[in-house]
C-alpha cells in the first residue's frame, strides 16, 4: 500500500482551509478523548479510478468520497482520518485531513474526496473514514467503512495499468486446442514480442473427480525475433485411460518483467459427450480395477510425450 507520488495532496475547497498529512492511524483523540465529537460521515463511496505518476506510469487508485451530515456537529469537526486496510496482508495506510479553519453551514452539503491510495489488482480493501476527533470510548462511532474489491488484470481498464502490463496483461495468446488421433492433443498459441521461454501445462481429470489423473509439462524455448507473434504448437500424448478425458491446459510465459509470476492463460477441454447409440465400452476401460505396474502407466508421467515445436505462418 502506498500513496501516489503526487506533487502536493490537496483537501482545501472554497470555504475551508485544509491540509493533508501522513498519519500513524492512531489519532491523538484516541489517547486524549474529547467531550464533544462530530457525527459520522455520510454516503461513503469508493470507486476505482486511474492516475498517472510523474513518471507517466498508470496505476489503479481508490477514489474515496463522502459527505457530512447536516447537523450541528460540524461545529466540532476538526478533520478526518482516511484508512485503507489490505485484507490479505493486514497492511494499513492512513492519511489525515486537518481542517485549518472552522466549517460553516452553507447552501450545499459539504463533500470531500481523496484519490491517492494506490491499490493492487485482484485485491480486497477495507476503506474507513473517521471524523475527528474520535469519540470517547463508549460514544457512538463516528466512522464509516466500506469494502473495495479491485478487479484483476483481465478487466479492460486494468489491463493497461503499469502493474498489469508488467505481468503480461497485453499478451493475448489466443490458445486453440485440437484433439488428434492416437490419444494426442495439439495446443497452439501466439507468441509475444519478447524472446522469453514458455511452459505449457496439461492436467487431466476424470469427468466426475476433481483431482488430477494425469499431468505433463512442456517447455518452449525463447523464440527468435522473427518468430514473435507467430503461432507455436505443442503436441501432448494423453493418458491411455479413456475416463481421464477432461483436460486443463495452461500457457505460462516467463516475461522479463514478471519472470515466474506472469499471468497464465488457460483453456479447458471437456470430456466428449457419449451419445446413447454408442456401444458402451467395457467398465475396465474407464475405471482401473488394479494398480498399474511400475513403468506401465501414463499416470503423473512428466517425461517427453511427443513433439514440441514452433510452427510459423508466413
Amino acid at each position: 500500500l502506498r500513496l501516489l507520488d503526487h506533487r502536493a495532496l490537496v483537501c482545501s475547497q472554497p470555504g475551508l482551509n485544509c491540509t493533508v498529512k501522513n498519519s500513524t492511524c492512531l489519532d491523538d483523540s484516541w489517547i486524549h478523548p474529547r467531550n464533544l465529537t462530530p457525527s459520522s460521515p455520510k454516503d461513503l463511496q469508493i470507486q476505482l479510478h486511474f492516475a498517472h505518476t510523474q513518471q507517466g506510469d498508470l496505476f489503479p487508485v481508490a477514489h474515496i468520497e463522502w459527505t457530512l451530515q447536516t447537523d450541528a456537529s460540524i461545529l466540532y469537526l476538526e478533520g478526518a482520518e482516511l484508512s485503507v486496510l489490505q485484507l490479505n496482508t493486514n497492511e494499513r495506510l492512513c492519511v489525515r485531513f486537518e481542517f485549518l479553519s472552522k466549517l460553516r453551514h452553507h447552501h450545499r452539503r459539504w463533500r470531500f474526496t481523496f484519490s491517492h491510495f494506490v491499490v493492487d489488482p485482484d485485491q480486497e480493501y477495507e476503506v474507513t473514514v473517521h471524523h475527528l476527533p474520535k469519540p470517547i470510548p463508549d460514544g457512538d462511532p463516528n466512522h464509516q467503512s466500506k469494502n473495495f474489491l479491485v478487479p484483476d488484470c483481465e478487466h479492460a481498464r486494468m489491463k493497461v495499468t503499469t502493474p498489469c502490463m508488467s505481468s503480461g496483461s497485453l499478451w493475448d495468446p489466443n490458445i486453440t486446442v485440437e484433439t488428434l488421433e492416437a490419444h494426442q492433443l495439439r495446443v497452439s498459441f501466439t507468441l509475444w514480442n519478447e524472446s522469453t521461454p514458455y511452459q505449457v501445462l496439461l492436467e487431466s481429470f476424470s469427468d466426475s473427480e476433481n483431482h488430477s489423473c494425469f499431468d505433463v509439462v512442456k517447455q518452449i524455448f525463447a523464440p527468435r525475433q522473427e518468430e514473435f507473434h507467430q503461432r507455436a504448437n505443442v503436441t501432448f500424448t494423453l493418458s491411455k485411460f479413456h475416463w481421464c478425458c477432461h483436460h486443463h491446459v495452461q500457457v505460462q510465459p516467463f516475461f522479463s518483467s514478471c519472470l515466474n509470476d506472469c499471468l497464465r492463460h488457460a483453456v479447458t477441454v471437456p470430456c466428449p459427450v457419449i451419445s446413447n447409440t454408442t456401444v458402451p465400452k467395457p467398465v475396465a476401460d474407464y475405471i482401473p480395477l488394479w494398480e498399474p505396474r511400475s513403468g506401465s502407466s501414463d499416470y503423473k508421467d512428466d517425461d517427453d510425450k511427443g513433439s514440441s515445436h514452433h510452427h510459423h505462418h508466413h
Epitope: L87, T89, E91, R92, E126, S145, N147
Partner: antibody, heavy 118, light 107 residues
C-alpha cells in the same frame, strides 16, 4: 503480552449450535482483521473465516458457508464464531488467529475443542 | 478456488541433513505464501511469510523461496526440535487455503 484466548467449545449433537469466543489482549484489536482456523483430529489445518477490522469484509470457507457467522466487538476486544447446523465433520480444535502485517498469521490462541456427535 | 498441494506428505531425515518441502498452487499467487510449523499437541507457528521473509525469532536454518505457483521451504541442517508438521498457506485472496501438510521426523 500479545494473547488470544478461545472459549465456548464443547460437545453438541448434529444439528446443534455453539458460539465460540476469542478474547484478545496486548495489542490494538480494532486495527487487525481476525481469522478462525480449525483442525480436525489427526488432520491438517483448515481456514474457516476472516473478518476485517471494521467488519465490512467477511469471508467463509465453502464448507461452513451459510452455517457459521463470524463477528467481532472492538469495544470488548472480542471475536466470535456462531456455529449452527453442526455436522460430524465440524468436530475439530478451533483456533482464532491474528494476521501479521505483511502476511501469514503470527498470533494464535491455544484452541478450543468442538465435538459434534450423536 | 485455488488448490494447494505439498510434497512429500512425510519424510524422515537424519540430524544435520538438508530438508526441502515443496508447495504448489494451482494458479499463480505471486509471493502471497506463508509457511507454518506445528508440533504435536501445539498450535501452529509462523515460520515464513511473503514466500521468503523469515518471521522474527525463527532460526536462520529455515528459508523459503519461490513465486507464482511453486514454493520451497528448506531446513538447511535438520535439528531434533524440527520434528513437526509443516504447512503452507496462500493468502493472495480469500479463501486462505492451507496445504495438506508435510510430516517431518528424524531417522
Amino acid at each position: 503480552e500479545v494473547q488470544l484466548v478461545e472459549s465456548g467449545g464443547g460437545s453438541v449433537q448434529p444439528g446443534g449450535s455453539l458460539r465460540l469466543s476469542c478474547a484478545a489482549s496486548g495489542f490494538t484489536f480494532s486495527s487487525y482483521s481476525m481469522n478462525w482456523v480449525r483442525q480436525a483430529p489427526g488432520k491438517g489445518l483448515e481456514w474457516v473465516s476472516i473478518i476485517s477490522s471494521r467488519s465490512s469484509i467477511i469471508h467463509y470457507a465453502d464448507s461452513v458457508k451459510g452455517r457459521f457467522t463470524i463477528s467481532r466487538d472492538n469495544a470488548k476486544n472480542s471475536l466470535y464464531l456462531q456455529m449452527n447446523s453442526l455436522r460430524d465433520e465440524d468436530t475439530a480444535v478451533y483456533y482464532c488467529a491474528r494476521p501479521k502485517v505483511g502476511g501469514g498469521m503470527d498470533v494464535w490462541g491455544q484452541g478450543t475443542t468442538v465435538t459434534v456427535s450423536s | 478456488d485455488i488448490q494447494m498441494t505439498q510434497s512429500p506428505s512425510s519424510l524422515s531425515a537424519s540430524v544435520g541433513d538438508r530438508v526441502t518441502i515443496t508447495c504448489r498452487a494451482s494458479q499463480g499467487i505471486s509471493n502471497y505464501l506463508a509457511w507454518y510449523q506445528q508440533k504435536p499437541g501445539k498450535f501452529p507457528e509462523l515460520l515464513i511469510y511473503a514466500a521468503s521473509t523469515l518471521q522474527s525469532g525463527v532460526p536462520s536454518r529455515f528459508s523459503g523461496s519461490g513465486s507464482g505457483t511453486d514454493f520451497t521451504l528448506t531446513i538447511s541442517s535438520l535439528q531434533p526440535e524440527d520434528v513437526a508438521t509443516y504447512y503452507c498457506q496462500k493468502y493472495n485472496r480469500a479463501p486462505f487455503t492451507f496445504g495438506p501438510g508435510t510430516k517431518v521426523d528424524i531417522k
